[in-house]
C-alpha cells in the first residue's frame, strides 16, 4: 500500500466558517461530552466546565469553575511540582451519570477527586469522593474512562508517581480492578475505552463487554529497547471477580496484540494513538479505527487501521494463551501455552452455556479457572486488521485523533469517511477509493498550530459537526465545506461523499443537508467531472497595462493535485523564460510590456484523477498593453517596485467550451469573476490581477495607491 | 434445612494425629461454589481458620499449620474429614465445621456446626 | 502481611453507635466478612463482602471497607449486641483465610 498523497485541497483558518470557543485565562480544552439530545456540547478544561450550544459552541450556556485551594497548592509545590501549572485541576473525567447530573474528575493538585455536576443548576454537589484509579494524579499521565449503567470504567495510574497502572470499575455493588502485575499491565499508556453491548437477540445470553486500548511495554518480545505494544483489553460488564482468588479483581481481564503494518514493507506501526468505535445500522458488528505511530517515528509517519470487533472477539473467545517460563538465570520469556485450558474457559464472560452448568456468577468461577486467567491474561493470537492492511498511511505528518463517519453516496456506495486530526492543529478528511487513499481535505482548525487533543463527531442528523479540543480552546467544523466548491466541476473532483452539485441552483450542496430528493443532483465519486453539464459562458477580465510595466494575472487553483500552466493564443507559456515567470506556483507576472503581449491568457488546470487527466480553464484574461500618455502634472511618487499599471478592468463575455473555475487552494481568496452573471459564490478562482498603479492620469493623489478589482464577493 | 456436625475424639495425647469428621445435610458438595472449612477457637482465644475443600476439590489451607493438615471428602456420604498431626497442648480448642455459600451472596460461612472441643494432654 | 488488627474490646451506651475496626495491609483489596459470636455458641455473619447485609441480620449493622481499615458499624446498640466480633478476609497471596483478634463489645 501507498502512502496517502497529500490532502487536495487546503483549507486555512481564515478562509472557512468554523465556530471557536474558548476562555480567558482558561486551558486544556482536553474532555469533550455531547449531548445529542439537548444539542449541548460540555467542554471540561483546566480548573472549569462549560456548557455550550451544539450548533453554535461560540453560545456559552453555562459555566462552573472547581479550582485547587491554595493550602493544596502549596501541599502539592512541597511534593516538587509546578504551581503555575501540575497543582492545578485538569477535568480528566466528564462522563453523564444520568439526565440531570455528569460524573466529573480532576487532577487536583495530585489529589483526585470525582464530584457529580448537577446540570439543572450547573452546580457541583461537593461530595469529593477519591478520584483515585479514576482520574490521574498527573496530568500529563493517560487516562481513558466510559460510564457504563451509572458506573465508571476507567484506565489510568493508581499513585501519584503514576507507576501503578489500574483497569478499574468504580461500582459501590462490585468494585474491581486489574491484579498489579506485570503480565496485566506493564507501563501503558491509555487511549480509549469503550462499552459494546451484546445484542439482545443474542443466542447465547452474552454479557456487555467493555474494550481499553492501550499501548504497553512489551514482554513477549524482548530487544535491546524497550519495545512498545498496541494493546486490545476487554472486561465483561457482569464480572464481579472471584470469591477467593482474584477476589475483588476481574475474572475476565484479557488483552491481545493489535497489529498494524504494512506487509510489504516491514513498517510496523506500534504505538496507539486514537480509537473510534464506528458504530452503523448497516454494521452487524462495530468496527473500531485505530491510529497508531511507529515507535522511533523520526520521519513524522501515522497510520490508520480497521478492525472488526468479531476479529477480536474470537481472539479472545478461542484464541491461544501466552505463557511465562522462567529460563536461564530466572530470565522470563514469553510463550504460547499448549496445555489444557480449564473449564470453563478462563476470561470468558458468563455466558448460558456457563449458567446451565451452575456458573451463575464469576464467585462462583472454580479456583483452576481463576488461577489461570490470573496468570494468562495475554493472548498468543493477535487482532488483525480488516484486509490484512492498514486503511491509510500518511508520511510527514504526526495524527493525534481520530473520528469517523459511515456515509453514503448518491449511488448508494457507502463510505467510511475518517477525520484524523494532526500536531499542528489541522484536521483531514479521508476516505477509501478503490484501494486507494483519498485525502479530500485538510482544514487548519487552529491558527497556532497547537496539537488537537481530542476529537468528536455529532451524529444527529441535519446539522452534523466536529468538535475539536485543544490546550487553548474547541473548534466546531462542518463534515464538508460543500458550499465552497463554485462549479460543478470542483464540486466532483472534490470527491467528497457528503457533496453533489445541483444544477438547478448551480451549488455544490451538502448531501444530508437537501430536504428536496437527490433526483438531479451530481455526484461521481470516481471523479469523473464529464457528467457536469457544458457551459456555454464564460468570463474574460480585460486589463489595459501600460508599456514597460509588469502584470501579474491571477489563477486561484484550490486543488493541491493540479498542475497549472497558462496559454497566450492557445500556445503554452514556459514560464522559465526571462519574460515570465510564476508567483506562488499558480499566478502569471509578465515582465517588461510591449505590445506584442496583448491577447488572450488562459490559466488552465490539469489534474490526474485515476487513469484520466481532467483538464480545467481556472482563469481567462484579456489583456491590452497601451502607452500612457503623461500626465499634465506629474505627481511626485514615493519609490516602488510596480507591477504594471492598469488603467481600467472589464469584463468580457466570451464562449468557451467546458470552462471552469477552480477548485479550493492553499491561501487564496475566493472571487466569482469567471461565471457570469456575476454572484457571490465562494469558489476559490480568481482572476483578477494585482495591480500597483503608479501613475494615473486626473488623480491628484501624493502617494502610491494600491487597487483591486472587486471580488464580487 | 443446612446443619454440619463436627464429629471425633474429645482428647487426644501430645503427637498423636486428631482425626475430625464433618457430616452435614441439605446441601451437596458437588454443586457449583459450594465449600466447607475447618475453623478452631482455643478457649477464650479468637478465631484461627485451618482448611477448605470445595466442590471442584480445590484445597487450601493455614499457611502455619500447612506441614500438619490434611482434608478430603467424601462426596457420597455427606462428610469431611480433617486430620491434623503431631498434635499439641497449645492444639487444644473448639474445632468448627462450616459450609462456604456460593454465588453472588456467597464468600462467607453461612452455616456452622455447634463445635467440638478437643483437648490436647498427656 | 496475614493480620487482621482489631481493638480488643469497645464500650457503649444503648441507643448509640459502636464502630469496630479491622486494620490490614491494602485491606480495601480484599472483601471483609464481619461475624458475631456469643459465649458458648458458633459465629453469627453479620456483614458480608464488605458491607452486604445477610437476611435476616438488622438494618443497624452496617459495614465499610477503605484504605487499609473496614469498620463495622452498629447504629442504635442494644443489649443484645454485647458480643465478640471478628473481621474475616482471604488473603490472596497465601491463599488462606485470616481471622482479626476479635472485639469484645459491651453494651453499658
Known amino acids: 500500500m501507498a502512502f496517502a498523497p497529500i490532502p487536495r485541497i487546503t483549507w486555512e483558518h481564515r478562509e472557512v466558517h468554523l465556530v471557536q470557543f474558548h476562555e480567558p485565562d482558561i486551558y486544556n480544552y482536553s474532555a469533550l461530552l455531547l449531548s445529542e439530545d439537548k444539542d449541548t456540547l460540555y467542554i471540561g478544561a483546566r480548573e472549569a466546565v462549560f456548557a455550550v450550544n451544539a450548533l453554535n459552541i461560540s453560545e456559552k450556556q453555562h459555566e462552573v469553575y472547581w479550582k485547587v485551594s491554595e493550602d493544596k497548592k502549596a501541599k502539592c509545590a512541597e511534593k516538587g511540582k509546578s504551581k503555575q501549572t501540575e497543582c492545578l485541576n485538569y477535568i480528566r473525567v466528564l462522563q453523564p451519570l444520568s439526565a440531570t447530573s455528569l460524573y466529573v474528575c480532576g487532577t487536583n493538585a495530585f489529589q483526585p477527586a470525582c464530584d457529580h455536576l448537577n446540570l439543572t443548576s450547573f452546580k457541583f454537589l461537593g461530595k469529593n469522593e477519591d478520584g483515585k484509579g479514576r482520574c490521574p494524579f498527573d496530568p500529563a499521565h493517560s487516562y481513558t474512562s466510559v460510564m457504563v449503567d451509572g458506573e465508571l470504567y476507567s484506565g489510568t495510574s493508581y499513585n501519584f508517581l503514576g507507576s501503578e497502572p489500574i483497569i478499574s470499575r468504580n461500582s459501590s455493588h462490585s468494585p474491581l480492578r486489574t491484579e498489579y502485575a506485570i503480565p496485566w499491565l506493564n507501563e501503558p499508556s491509555f487511549v480509549f475505552a469503550d462499552v459494546i453491548r451484546k445484542s439482545p437477540d443474542s443466542p447465547d445470553g452474552e454479557d456487555d463487554r467493555v474494550y481499553f486500548f492501550f499501548t504497553e511495554v512489551s514482554v513477549e518480545y524482548e530487544f535491546v529497547f524497550r519495545v512498545l505494544i498496541p494493546r486490545i483489553a476487554r472486561v465483561c460488564k457482569g464480572d464481579q471477580g472471584g470469591l477467593r482468588t482474584l477476589q475483588k479483581k476481574w475474572t475476565s481481564f484479557l488483552k491481545a496484540r493489535l497489529i498494524c503494518s504494512r506487509p510489504d514493507s516491514g513498517l510496523v506501526f506500534n504505538v496507539l494513538r486514537d480509537v473510534f468505535v464506528l458504530r452503523s445500522p448497516g454494521l452487524k458488528v462495530p468496527v473500531f479505527y485505530a491510529l497508531f505511530t511507529p515507535q522511533l517515528n523520526n520521519v513524522g509517519l501515522s497510520a490508520v487501521c480497521a478492525y472488526n470487533l468479531s476479529t477480536a472477539e474470537e481472539v479472545f473467545s478461542h484464541g491461544k494463551y501466552m505463557q511465562s517460563t522462567t529460563v536461564e538465570q530466572s530470565h522470563t520469556k514469553w510463550v504460547r501455552y499448549n496445555g489444557p485450558v480449564p473449564k470453563p474457559r478462563p476470561g470468558a464472560c458468563i455466558d448460558s452455556e456457563a449458567r446451565a452448568a451452575n456458573y451463575t456468577s464469576s464467585l462462583n468461577l472454580p479456583d483452576k479457572t481463576l488461577q489461570f486467567v490470573k496468570d494468562h491474561p495475554l493472548m498468543d493470537d493477535s487482532v488483525t486488521p480488516i484486509d490484512n492492511r492498514p486503511r491509510l498511511i500518511k508520511k510527514d505528518v504526526n495524527y493525534t485523533q481520530i473520528v469517523v463517519d459511515r456515509t453514503q453516496a448518491l449511488d448508494g456506495t457507502v463510505y467510511d469517511v475518517m477525520f484524523v486530526s494532526t500536531d499542528r492543529g489541522a484536521l483531514h478528511k479521508a476516505i477509501s477509493l478503490e484501494h486507494a487513499v483519498h485525502i479530500i481535505e485538510e482544514t487548519q482548525l487552529f491558527q497556532d498550530f497547537e496539537p488537537v487533543q481530542t476529537l468528536l463527531l455529532s451524529s444527529k442528523k441535519g446539522n452534523r459537526f466536529v468538535y475539536a479540543g485543544s490546550n487553548s480552546g474547541v473548534v466546531q467544523a462542518p463534515l464538508a465545506f460543500c458550499g465552497k466548491h463554485g462549479t460543478c466541476e470542483d464540486c466532483v473532483l472534490a470527491r467528497d461523499p457528503y457533496c453533489a452539485w445541483s444544477p438547478p441552483t448551480a451549488t455544490c450542496v451538502a448531501l444530508h443537508q437537501t430536504e428536496s430528493p437527490s433526483r438531479g443532483l451530481i455526484q461521481e465519486m470516481s471523479g469523473d467531472a464529464s457528467v457536469c453539464p457544458d457551459k456555454s459562458k464564460g468570463s474574460y477580465r480585460q486589463h489595459f497595462f501600460k508599456h514597460g510595466g509588469t502584470a501579474e494575472l491571477k489563477c486561484s487553483q484550490k486543488s493541491n493535485l493540479a498542475r497549472v500552466f497558462w496559454k497566450f493564443q492557445n500556445g503554452v507559456l514556459k514560464a522559465e523564460s526571462p519574460k515570465y515567470g510564476l508567483m506562488g506556483r499558480k499566478n502569471l507576472l509578465i515582465f517588461n510590456l510591449s505590445e506584442g503581449d496583448s491577447g488572450v491568457y488562459q490559466c488552465l488546470s490539469e489534474e490526474r484523477v485515476k487513469n484520466k487527466t481532467v483538464f480545467q480553464v481556472v482563469a481567462k484574461h484579456v489583456l491590452e498593453v497601451k502607452v500612457v500618455p503623461k500626465p499634465v502634472v506629474a505627481p511626485t511618487l514615493s519609490v516602488v517596485q510596480t507591477e504594471g499599471s492598469r488603467i481600467a478592468t472589464k469584463v468580457l463575455v466570451a464562449s468557451t467550451q467546458g470552462s471552469s473555475p477552480p477548485t479550493p487552494a492553499v491561501q487564496a481568496t475566493s472571487s466569482g469573476a469567471i461565471t457570469l452573471p456575476p454572484k457571490p459564490a465562494p469558489t476559490g478562482t480568481s482572476c483578477e490581477p494585482k495591480i500597483v498603479i503608479n501613475t494615473v492620469p486626473q488623480l491628484h493623489s501624493e502617494k502610491t495607491m494600491y487597487l483591486k478589482s472587486s471580488d464580487n464577493r | 434445612q443446612v446443619t454440619l456436625k463436627e464429629s471425633g475424639p474429645t482428647l487426644v495425647k501430645p503427637t498423636q494425629t486428631l482425626t475430625l469428621a464433618c457430616s452435614f445435610s441439605?446441601?451437596?458438595?458437588?454443586?457449583?461454589?459450594?465449600?466447607v472449612t475447618w475453623i478452631r477457637q482455643p478457649p477464650g482465644k479468637a478465631l484461627e481458620w485451618l482448611a477448605l475443600?470445595?466442590?471442584?476439590?480445590?484445597?487450601y489451607y493455614s499457611t502455619s499449620l500447612k506441614t500438619r493438615l490434611t482434608i478430603s471428602k467424601d462426596t457420597s456420604k455427606n462428610q469431611v474429614v480433617l486430620t491434623m498431626t503431631n498434635m499439641d497442648p497449645v492444639d487444644t480448642a473448639t474445632y468448627y465445621c462450616?459450609?462456604?455459600?456460593?454465588?453472588?451472596?456467597?464468600?462467607?460461612?453461612?452455616?456452622w456446626g455447634q463445635g467440638t472441643l478437643v483437648t490436647v494432654s498427656s | 502481611s496475614s493480620e487482621l488488627t482489631q481493638a480488643p474490646s469497645v464500650s457503649v451506651s444503648p441507643g448509640q453507635t459502636a464502630s469496630i475496626t479491622c486494620s490490614g495491609d491494602?485491606?480495601?483489596?480484599?472483601?471483609v466478612y464481619w461475624y458475631q459470636q456469643k459465649p458458648g455458641q458458633p459465629p453469627v455473619l453479620v456483614i458480608y463482602?464488605?458491607?452486604k447485609r445477610p437476611s435476616g441480620i438488622p438494618e443497624r449493622f452496617s459495614g465499610s471497607n477503605s484504605g487499609n481499615t473496614a469498620t463495622l458499624t452498629i447504629s442504635a446498640t442494644q443489649a443484645l449486641d454485647e458480643a465478640d466480633y471478628y473481621c474475616?478476609?482471604?488473603?490472596?497471596?497465601?491463599?488462606?483465610?485470616?481471622f482479626g483478634t476479635g472485639t469484645k463489645v459491651t453494651v453499658l
Open positions: 462450616a459450609r462456604i455459600a456460593s454465588g453472588d451472596s456467597g464468600g462467607y460461612f453461612a452455616d
Open positions: 441439605g446441601f451437596s458438595l458437588t454443586t457449583t461454589g459450594v465449600a
Open positions: 475443600i470445595d466442590w471442584d476439590d480445590d484445597k
Open positions: 491494602k485491606l480495601d483489596d480484599k472483601y
Open positions: 463482602r464488605d458491607n
Open positions: 474475616q478476609a482471604w488473603e490472596s497471596s497465601s491463599d488462606q483465610y485470616v
